[in-house]
């Protein structure tokens, strides 16, 4: 009955503070409405990074001020998190909820450790 969610163990953010990873879920049923949430876990505290509800076959729509963007293809969601700094290094968990039709299913990934390295400032040029 449990829904399995797979995501990569480790991802390195780009020098521009952008990290992308795939979140794939094994849907036990034919869901038409899915909610995907990215959570950050640090010191056993969990916070929401971003969330989007989408209809199967349609694009993911995050809120305008969200740091996340994404696309969906079948049971795969391609997530991109932007604006990351070194202090944002941590475990990012993909949570998937099959909202409709019944039954409801919850899937929690093991998390992706995202490493963010702030770029070195450019040396002053004379």
């Amino acid at each position: 009955k449990a829904m399995h969610v797979a995501q990569p163990a480790v991802v390195l953010a780009s020098s521009r503070g952008i990290a992308s990873f795939v979140c794939e879920y094994a849907s036990p049923g034919k869901a038409t409405e899915v909610r995907v949430t990215v959570l950050r876990q640090a010191d056993s505290q969990v916070t929401e990074v971003c969330a989007a509800t989408y209809m199967m076959g349609n694009e993911l729509t995050f809120l305008d001020d969200s740091i996340c963007t994404g696309t969906s293809s079948g049971n795969q969601v391609n997530l991109t998190i932007q604006g990351l700094r070194a202090m944002d290094t941590g475990l990012y968990i993909c949570k998937v909820e099959l909202m409709y039709p019944p039954p409801y299913y919850l899937g929690i990934g093991n998390g992706t450790q995202i490493y963010v390295i702030d770029p070195e400032p450019c040396p002053d040029s004379d």
Partner: antibody
Framework: QVQLVESGGGVVQPGRSLRLSCAAS????????MHWVRQAPGKGLEWVTF????????YYADSVKGRFTISRDNSKNTLYLQMNSLRAEDTAIYYC???????????WGQGTLVTVSS | EIVLTQSPGTLSLSPGERATLSCRAS???????LAWYQQKPGQAPRLLIY???SRATGIPDRFSGSGSGTDFTLTISRLEPEDFAVYYC?????????FGQGTKVEIK
């Protein structure tokens, strides 16, 4: 701090209706799914109903399907339970509960007692 | 529907003793979706353990959870006076959300 406060319980005759409320504070209400759970006197916990973030998706236990309706007003940070055609077996303490980020019910209200009796 | 069966129904122990509570599911439950709650008389339930073995905020480390598949265990390593209560397991991986019938831990 997170707080859930239920109200609206009381004594009601079989066949009548009652509406429970759960006022939420200390968190962004619209970011969480919510539940009602009940406990008959001296008995265990029974899940009653669930509502999604925006209120569009609702699930019910078979024992209340067609009689109870869950709803929420995110602008008022309030969860509701409309109970119609009440039966003696609906007598219980009714708790509202928040779904934590990882799925368990991480915060509960203090409960409100509903007694269905003639 | 996933049926959860808890055993024993009542556990009579003395303070300082170890308590082992069992929860068995009628079908496989992912360990990410199994929780334990504590309830004292006149109070609402309180989340103790989620994801089968992660302690909720503020829960002392004498409480631990284990198990996978269909068999789960809550262990209280050394019972304190405030631990005497009723304990419920719950699965939250799919609807309908279900609870076990509870195990009462009472003072011997």
């Amino acid at each position: 701090q997170v707080q859930l406060v239920e109200s609206g319980g009381g004594v009601v005759q079989p066949g009548r209706s009652l509406r429970l409320s759960c006022a939420a504070s200390g968190f962004t209400f619209s970011h969480y799914t919510m539940h009602w759970v009940r406990q008959a006197p001296g008995k265990g916990l029974e899940w009653v109903t669930f509502i999604s973030y925006d209120g569009n998706n609702k699930y019910y236990a078979d024992s209340v399907k067609g009689r109870f309706t869950i709803s929420r007003d995110n602008s008022k940070n309030t969860l509701y339970l409309q109970m119609n055609s009440l039966r003696a077996e609906d007598t219980a303490i009714y708790y509202c509960a928040r779904t934590g980020w990882l799925g368990p019910f991480d915060y509960w209200g203090q409960g409100t007692l509903v007694t269905v009796s003639s | 529907e996933i049926v959860l069966t808890q055993s024993p129904g009542t556990l009579s122990l003395s303070p300082g003793e170890r308590a082992t509570l069992s929860c068995r599911a009628s079908q496989s439950v992912g360990s990410s979706y199994l929780a334990w709650y504590q309830q004292k008389p006149g109070q609402a339930p309180r989340l103790l353990i989620y994801g089968a073995f992660s302690r909720a905020t503020g829960i002392p480390d004498r409480f631990s959870g284990s198990g996978s598949g269909t068999d789960f265990t809550l262990t209280i390593s050394r019972l304190e006076p405030e631990d005497f209560a009723v304990y419920y397991c719950q699965q939250y991986g799919s609807s309908p959300w279900t609870f076990g019938q509870g195990t009462k831990v009472e003072i011997k």
